[in-house]
Interface confidence: low
């Protein structure tokens, strides 16, 4: 556990007066309807709020929307609806905010039935001004910005056309028809699937995967018989129909689709699916659904090529395609992921990995908690985390687990303590060491958020009654203060703080209800005066991540290196500040066999860390043979785990084997590829 100096709770001095001076109410001149909020840029303080209200008339529904803008983190709002000509904005498209600090915003308007195309409002100055543009098509999807150039937009039309703009939506060009799915890749590349015989649904499994690297001037067919495709890290994946039956296989490319290799993963049938759970430039977590309507599958982790996969976790909970999985990347500590498994008795249990999927284990029972009714042994049980699946099942869980990269080690989640997830009302738990140890933080369900890179945690009780109290902690959830932010309770709808957890402002959203009307209201609280001074060197302490045995020289080694962080002392009440950068000191570890995975043609017998050659590859066929190459497949049986930085120590290099003789069956023969220009 990260060091916690003060066990007793000291009160933050004069906090009521300090917070009262920094609490800003804004009542919106709106009927209730719905509200959506977007931050424009990073550290700009600009927030856009769109309220929409549908008035059902006898013959049709009349829509009204209003647009508000704040440039002080939500303390004050100005009605800017006139900038969009009082047009009704379609909420299903949301507000398309440009990448980075481009200051770009696109709003999609509702247009009357007979119009030739849709209408958008565009801003490139953080929503100070908007330009109305009529589209030559009706958009089916929200405008998608190229990650590399915010002037480049793409959208699909209701007629399945792929439209591209090179000047931030001023002019549009249809670059391809019959398009099912389109995504930006790197370097302004667009990948998309097309159908030939009628529709996306009818042609599923017979789609073609296309690429354009010049915004539609020229195209290249990079795959046929495609079911779907996805991008993750530097990997491009496609699931491809097999020649002879209805099964599909994953193929992977690391060169934008010029060349492909068959991933060493099981094929799936019509009712099954693949899902990329997480991906970075090193590796991929892939879920492969089990046959039948089981609700679970297997997680596999890839090598650095995305080709060779190791089984990581069995019975991984993932309901139908596009359904729910609890898979969560704990962003506050490297290598940590949490998810749920469906056990044989159909109970759901939480598992955690600290080494990027190498090993999974149950979460340690919090020391200040009792085992609940699900536990067979009242002294031995685990913490089980509520995530997307629990929320989808309408359990009393208002929020998914929360972690932030700049709040090192902190994980906050709803959970229950027992042998499995309980349907009883959950409590909120916190870990300050990336999931190794846990403490009950708050009794009952809450909304929560992290401010000032972990310097403040804010929470609001999840209640069906109106609320007027907020809780906050300056010591990573050990001690809590309560502040009454308004005399008149509101029906709470959400907490909003600037993404990135660097802000010290929190906005509480809700509505007031009186006999005749209900109105949107927000309260923005600035905690800057609670954290009166800037943090100094003495406020930080050294913390070794992943430390489980301080006596061990290799303590803290994960994926070949250990990291020491400077962590804010729990007892220090000071500002990390907006410019806070996580300070870490990495050191390389000696290699052990744990730093290597088994290459194709090799496996690890249970409870053995050595890779042993498979007797023959007949059952696995040629998919292990890289790039479809029928020769020169050499391996020493080991391959370093992606992202592993170990040096020295164990070097499992052995006699190099030539595996070409085991590659016996024929590959699907490449046919002529299609390239064309517009």
């Amino acid at each position: 556990s990260a060091p916690g100096e003060d066990e007793e709770c000291g009160r933050v001095r004069d906090f009521v007066a300090k917070l009262a001076n920094n609490t800003h109410q804004h009542v919106f001149d709106d009927l209730r309807g719905s509200v959506s909020l977007s931050w424009v840029g990073d550290s700009t303080g600009v927030i856009l709020v769109l309220t929409t209200f549908h008035v059902p008339l006898v013959i049709m529904t009349f829509g009204q929307s209003k647009l508000y803008r704040s440039e002080d983190y939500g303390k004050n709002f100005k009605d800017i609806t006139d900038l969009i000509n009082n047009t009704f904005i379609r909420t299903e498209f949301g507000m398309a905010i440009g990448p980075e600090n481009s200051g770009k915003v696109v709003l999609t308007a509702e247009v009357s039935g007979g119009s030739r195309g849709g209408r958008i409002f565009r801003s490139s100055d953080f929503a100070k001004n908007f330009v109305q543009t009529d589209l030559p098509f009706h958009p089916l999807t929200q405008m998608m910005y190229s990650p590399q150039n915010s002037d480049y937009l793409l959208a699909l039309s209701t007629e399945n056309g792929l439209w591209v703009s090179k000047n931030f939506g001023g002019k549009w060009e249809e670059i391809h028809k019959a398009v099912c799915l389109a995504k930006w890749g790197s370097d302004n590349t667009i990948f998309f699937t097309t159908y030939a015989n009628g529709s996306c649904k009818a042609d599923l499994g017979a789609l073609e995967l296309w690429r354009t690297s010049d915004l539609g001037k020229s195209f290249k067919t990079i795959g046929v018989k495609i079911y779907s495709f996805g991008l993750g890290g530097r990997f491009l994946f496609a699931s491809v129909m097999a020649d002879k039956d209805t099964t599909r296989r994953i193929h992977v490319s690391t060169d934008q689709g010029d060349t492909w290799s068959m991933a060493q993963l099981p094929s799936v049938g019509q009712e099954q699916f693949y899902s990329i759970l997480a991906a970075n430039d090193d590796m991929v977590f892939m879920h492969v659904d089990e046959p039948g309507d089981t609700g679970f599958g297997t997680i596999f982790t890839s090598d650095d090529r995305g080709i060779v996969y190791s089984k990581s976790l069995d019975r991984h909970l993932y309901t139908t395609t596009g359904g729910e999985t609890d898979f969560t990347n704990v962003t506050s500590l490297r290598g940590v992921y949490i998810t749920s498994v469906l056990s044989e008795d159909n109970s759901i249990q939480t598992m955690i990995t600290f080494d990027q999927g190498g090993r999974w284990t149950h979460l340690r029972k919090p020391e200040n908690s009792e085992c609940d009714a699900t536990a067979k042994n009242k002294n031995e049980c685990s913490l089980h985390i509520h995530a997307s699946y629990s929320i989808s099942q309408k359990l009393n869980v208002p929020m998914a687990p929360l972690s932030e990269p700049n709040a090192v080690g902190i994980v906050i989640a709803h959970g229950s303590v027992g042998d499995a997830i309980s349907v009883m009302v959950p409590d909120v738990y916190i870990s300050d060491d990336g999931g190794y140890s846990w403490t009950k933080m708050l009794e009952g369900p809450h909304y929560y958020t992290i401010l000032d890179s972990g310097g403040i945690i804010v929470a609001i009780e999840h209640s069906s009654r109106p609320i007027n109290v907020i809780k906050f902690s300056t010591d990573e959830g050990q001690c809590w203060q309560t502040y009454t932010f308004t005399r008149d309770p509101i029906y709470f709808t959400g907490l909003a703080s600037e993404p990135g957890a660097r802000s010290m402002n929190i906005s509480i959203w809700g509505f007031t209800e009186s006999f005749l009307t209900s109105q949107w209201v927000s309260y923005t609280i600035d905690f800057k005066d609670i954290l009166e001074r800037n943090c100094e060197e003495k406020d930080y302490t050294i913390w070794l991540a992943h430390s489980t045995d301080p006596e061990d020289y290799e303590d803290g080694c994960i994926l070949g290196y250990k990291e020491q962080f400077l962590r804010l002392r729990k007892s220090s009440v000071c500002q990390n500040g907006r410019d806070y950068v996580v300070t870490k000191q990495p050191s390389i570890c000696l290699c052990s066999l744990e730093d290597f995975l088994c290459d194709f043609g090799y496996y690890r017998p249970e409870n053995d860390s050595k890779c042993v050659e498979q007797p023959e590859l007949k059952g696995h066929d040629l998919e292990f043979c890289l790039y479809g190459r029928e020769e020169h497949l050499t391996t020493n049986g080991y391959r370093k785990i992606p992202g592993d930085k170990c040096q020295g120590g164990v070097n499992p290099v052995r006699e190099v084997k030539d595996l070409k003789k085991k590659c016996t069956s024929n590959f699907l023969s490449p046919e002529k590829q299609n390239s064309k220009s517009n």
Epitope: D255, G628, S675
Partner: antibody, heavy 129, light 107 residues
Framework: QVRLVQSGAEVRKPGASVKVSCKAS????????MSWVRQAPGQGLEWMGI????????SYAQKFQGRVTMTRDTSTSTVYMELSSLRSEDTAVYYC??????????????????????WGQGTTVTVSS | EIVMTQSPATLSVSPGERATLSCRAS??????LAWYQQKPGQAPRLLIY???TRATGIPARFSGSGSGTEFTLTISSLQSEDFAVYYC?????????FGGGTKVEIK
């Protein structure tokens, strides 16, 4: 513009090793495979092998298996070809060549061969006692 | 490995005439074939890829055709700078292999 610049001529005795470098510029190094091709005096072209700069994975012609090692340094956009246990018949000009389509893939209709579109100037290696 | 055979070994042609070079593969290479031109003391230069697509900057007098095992490179009207050695190369299956070359000389 796109260029491949190779290291200078080398003279080696039989049994020794030689390491030829090929520095790429003018394009994204990790996007293209690199092939090595050699040409003995008065003879035709002979493909030796290929390297994928992203992961460093390689594939060698059977004839050179065990004697050739291809590596890359992404920080300097350079690929290297080392040939060991040299014999007199290894006297040749060694070329690196950018190979956009890289290694054949098990993916139906996924590739048309693009050819080795950019070549280095060649490095003469002379093996003589 | 796939063996590539080029014919003829030498082709004598007058400037302005048409030259037809053949390349045969020992097994199908689909359209995974390229043609290169090499002049004395120089590195090879890519002419044709995908059996029939001209590489960037290659004049229209060069054309490629064929698929499977039989391929042809045609130079419609030979210019003085076209006298060189021409190689075909397959990339259907590793190892990549080249033909023995056809030398086009001035008649």
């Amino acid at each position: 513009q796109v260029r491949l610049v190779q290291s200078g001529a080398e003279v080696r005795k039989p049994g020794a090793s030689v390491k030829v470098s090929c520095k790429a510029s003018g394009y994204t190094f990790t996007k293209y495979y690199m092939s090595w091709v050699r040409q003995a005096p008065g003879q035709g072209l002979e493909w030796m092998g290929i390297i994928n700069p992203i992961g460093g994975s390689t594939s060698y012609a059977q004839k050179f298996q065990g004697r050739v090692t291809m590596t890359r340094d992404t920080s300097t956009s350079t690929v290297y070809m080392e040939l060991s246990s040299l014999r007199s018949e290894d006297t040749a000009v060694y070329y690196c060549a950018r190979d956009p389509s890289g290694i054949a893939a098990a993916f139906p209709a996924s590739r048309s061969y693009y050819g080795m579109d950019v070549w280095g100037q060649g490095t003469t290696v002379t093996v003589s006692s | 490995e796939i063996v590539m055979t080029q014919s003829p070994a030498t082709l004598s042609v007058s400037p302005g005439e048409r030259a037809t070079l053949s390349c045969r593969a020992s097994q199908s290479v689909s359209s995974n074939l390229a043609w290169y031109q090499q002049k004395p003391g120089q590195a090879p230069r890519l002419l044709i890829y995908g059996a029939s697509t001209r590489a960037t900057g290659i004049p229209a007098r060069f054309s490629g055709s064929g698929s499977g095992t039989e391929f042809t490179l045609t130079i419609s009207s030979l210019q003085s700078e076209d006298f060189a050695v021409y190689y075909c190369q397959q990339a259907r299956l590793g190892p990549w292999t080249f033909g023995g070359g056809t030398k086009v000389e001035i008649k």
